[in-house]
C-alpha cells in the first residue's frame, strides 16, 4: 500500500536570467527510493538520479541544469521558455511510483522572487 506523500515547492516564480530550485520531498513512507526522474512540461526528461548510478543530465541541458540540492534540481540562466510544469517522479520499493508537480513562471520583471514553501537541508 502506498502511504507516502510528495511535497513540492508548488507554484514558483523566478526572474529571467536567474536560477531556481525545483524540490520534491517524499514523506510518510519507509520505501526505498530507487530512482528520481525530473521531466519538463513537454514530457522531455531533464535529469535522472539513480540510487546506485548517480545523476544523469540530458546533454542539451547540461549547461543550465545542475543536480541538487538533495534529490532536487537547479535550473540556471532561465528563459521565458522555461515557464511551465515540471514533474518529479519517485520510483520506490516496495511502494511504487509517486509523482509531484511544480509550476514555474519565469518573469521579465526584476522584482520577481523565488520563494519556496520549504527547503531541504
Amino acid at each position: 500500500m502506498m502511504t507516502g506523500t510528495i511535497e513540492t515547492t508548488g507554484n514558483i516564480s523566478a526572474k529571467k536570467g536567474g536560477s531556481v530550485i525545483l524540490q520534491c520531498h517524499l514523506s510518510s513512507t519507509m520505501a526505498q527510493v530507487t530512482q528520481v526522474n525530473w521531466e519538463q512540461h513537454d514530457h522531455s526528461l531533464l535529469a535522472i538520479r539513480n540510487a546506485e548510478l548517480g545523476w544523469h543530465i540530458y546533454p542539451a541541458f547540461k549547461d543550465r541544469v545542475a543536480p541538487g540540492p538533495g534529490l532536487g534540481l537547479t535550473l540556471q540562466s532561465l528563459t521565458m521558455n522555461d515557464t511551465g510544469e515540471y514533474f518529479c517522479t519517485y520510483h520506490t520499493y516496495p511502494d511504487g511510483t509517486y509523482r509531484g508537480r511544480i509550476f514555474l513562471e519565469v518573469l521579465e520583471s526584476s522584482v520577481a522572487e523565488h520563494s519556496a514553501r520549504f527547503q531541504i537541508p
Partner: antibody, heavy 117, light 106 residues
Framework: EVQLVQSGAEVKKPGASVKVSCKAS????????IYWVRQAPGQRLEIMGR????????YYVDKFKNRATLTADTSASTAYMELSSLRSEDTAVYFC??????????WGQGTLVTVSS | DIQLTQSPSFLSASVGDRVTITCKGS??????LVWYQQKPGKAPKLLIY???NLQSGIPSRFSGSGSGTEYTLTISSLQPEDFATYFC????????FGQGTKVEIK
Amino acid sequence: EVQLVQSGAEVKKPGASVKVSCKASGYTFTEYSIYWVRQAPGQRLEIMGRIDPKNGRTYYVDKFKNRATLTADTSASTAYMELSSLRSEDTAVYFCTRIYGFYFDFWGQGTLVTVSS
Amino acid sequence: DIQLTQSPSFLSASVGDRVTITCKGSQNVNKYLVWYQQKPGKAPKLLIYNTDNLQSGIPSRFSGSGSGTEYTLTISSLQPEDFATYFCYQYNNGFTFGQGTKVEIK
C-alpha cells in the same frame, strides 16, 4: 567518428584479476561518462558501474561494489575496468559504452574474459 | 527496477519479410525505451531511442512504437545485413536490458 576500442581476450585462473582497457576517440573524453556492461553466455546485458572521466568519480552496482575497480586516464583517453577474485561465473564478454544522457550511444567491440582452471 | 521481456527469443525470417519484435516491461516504461542491434563479435549499435526516434544513419526500414509497458521494433523489409540479435533497454526505473531476440535466416 566516435570509437571505443577495447583490449583483447583474456584467459584467467579462478581467484586472479583481470584489467580491461577501453580507448576512446572522436570526442572529448571528459564530457561523457563511461559505463561497463557485461554479458555472460546466454544471459542478458548487465550493468557493472560507471566512471566520470572528468573527475574520476565512480559508481558501482551493489553486486560489483567489492570486486570491480573503474579508473580512467584522461591523458590517454582510456578507461579501465579491473575485476578481482575471478570465478567461473565471471566468464563473459565485457563492454565499455558511452552514455549520452540516459542511453548508451557508442559501444566498444567487447572483450571476452574466460575464467577457467 | 523494471524487468524487460522480449518476444520471441528466436525468429526465422527471409529477406524482404516484415519483422516485428516486442519488448514488455514489468512496469510502465514511460516511452523511455531504446533498441539496439548486435552482430557476433561486434559492438552493439543504437537503432532507436525514446521509443520511436531513429538514430542518425540508421535506415528508415527500422521503426519503433509503443507506450506504457509494451513496445515494438519493426523492420519493414528485412535485408541480408539485418540478421542479428536485437535487444531493448529502458531507463524509466533503473537501467535494464531485455534478453535479446535473434533474427536468423529461414
